[in-house]
Interface confidence: low
């Protein structure tokens, strides 16, 4: 065999991944590896994940002389330490006028009166806490309730006696009950006036309301 067959350790270089070959003897060599690689020929990518700094459940993904963190959906950033602002990502996260409040690792909704639940989609049953008088019917509304009174009862909670029950208004007048105090209100027909619509008035005057 001629000189072509002579073994030259660094020609060609056995070092891979950018490693630099250095001849250390007639038949020996040493590879100086770039950061991130190891092994006699720099063939191994060093696992940079052990003792990684990924936080909040982030999963480490090894790279070349570095690592990256694969973050759960509510976290972001190089090391999963930055909170994702769900309120920006989901403008309609809170329903029915609720206000979105970003929090570490999630978000919360501040609901307007009458709504509840994680996304303010549940109408609070105001009748559960209402004090309609027994015998009346409670109707749930948004952030309020109303009481439907049985015959003879009046007021917001049906706790008052209905003053209209005794027909105090005369001459075809309309009788209404003041929901605050239970007193009757007569709406007089044309030509009549007075609390009970019993008094005549001059022609040309329109309807009169009288409270009692």
């Amino acid at each position: 065999a001629g000189s072509d067959s002579l073994y030259v350790p660094c020609a060609p270089s056995p070092c891979v991944n950018g490693g630099t070959c250095r001849q250390t003897g007639d038949f020996t060599f040493e590879c100086n590896c770039l950061p991130g690689f190891e092994g006699s020929t720099c063939e191994r990518n060093i696992d940079d994940c052990p003792n990684h700094r990924c936080q909040n459940g982030g999963v480490c993904v090894d790279g070349v002389n570095t690592y990256n963190c694969r973050c759960p959906p509510q976290w972001t950033g190089q090391f999963c330490t930055e909170d994702v602002d769900e309120c920006l990502l989901q403008p309609n996260a809170c329903q029915n006028g609720g206000t979105c409040a970003n929090r570490n690792g999630g978000y919360g909704c501040v609901c307007v009166n009458g709504w509840s639940g994680d996304d303010c989609s549940e109408n609070i049953d105001d009748c559960a806490f209402a004090s309609c008088t027994p015998g009346s019917t409670c109707i749930d509304r948004v952030a309020s309730f109303s009481c439907m009174c049985p015959e003879g009862k009046a007021g917001l909670l049906c706790h008052l006696d209905d003053a209209c029950i005794s027909n105090p208004c005369h001459k075809g007048a309309l009788c209404d009950t003041n929901p605050l105090n239970g007193q009757y209100i007569c709406t007089c027909p044309q030509g009549y006036k007075g609390a009970d619509c019993t008094e005549d008035v001059d022609e040309g005057n329109s309807h009169h309301h009288h409270h009692h």
């Epitope: 950061p35 003792n51 950033g77 090391f79």
Partner: antibody, heavy 117, light 112 residues
Framework: EVQLVQSGAEVKKPGESLKISCKGS????????IHWVRQMPGKGPEWTGY????????KFNEKFKGQATISVDKSITTAYLQWSSLKASDTAMYYC??????????WGQGTLVTVSS | DVVMTQSPDSLAVSLGERATINCRSS???????????LHWFQQKPGQPPKLLIY???NRFSGVPDRFSGSGSGTDFTLTISSLQAEDVAVYYC?????????FGGGTKVEIK
Amino acid sequence: EVQLVQSGAEVKKPGESLKISCKGSGYTFSNYVIHWVRQMPGKGPEWTGYIIPGSGGTKFNEKFKGQATISVDKSITTAYLQWSSLKASDTAMYYCARDGAGSFTYWGQGTLVTVSS
Amino acid sequence: DVVMTQSPDSLAVSLGERATINCRSSQSLVHSDGNTYLHWFQQKPGQPPKLLIYRISNRFSGVPDRFSGSGSGTDFTLTISSLQAEDVAVYYCLQSTHFPDTFGGGTKVEIK
């Protein structure tokens, strides 16, 4: 080439404030945690705490909690160690070091802090 | 905190001879991920520590092959197979398995 260059030596009086710096270059600054290590005269090194440059999140050795703060300015790839009120016992060499391979792979040259009345 | 105890405190070795430094931890350094985070550093006067060996036995880039590490669990060894004049320094072990990271007290290596 990875380099961490620290600010120069400081001589301070007890009660004074101080902020020392560590500028990283030659690598993606946000990709690596920066540690601060204290070495008191004639003693071995002590890990003080670290900062995550990407987020500014910090973690401290309980022994040093509340004594100093660590911050970062990503725009100039620089980490800081700061005291609001120095004590004589803070006299030491302070090193910054870059995280990697589960250890401290590259170190700054150190900043000597002397606190004396 | 995990206590790292190095021995001996100082060591005088002839040029070309073997130097052996021991490091013992107060608890096992085997991490839940299966790795052991025990590292060795060299520090020369007026210089910062320099990483020699990481995770028991892996030489850091540019570190001569006369430096080697071994051990497991709680007992670890740094060996300099043939001491050179430039190896005069203080050597520290460091564990980063358990929070917080803790260094050993150091071993001073001199030439006999």
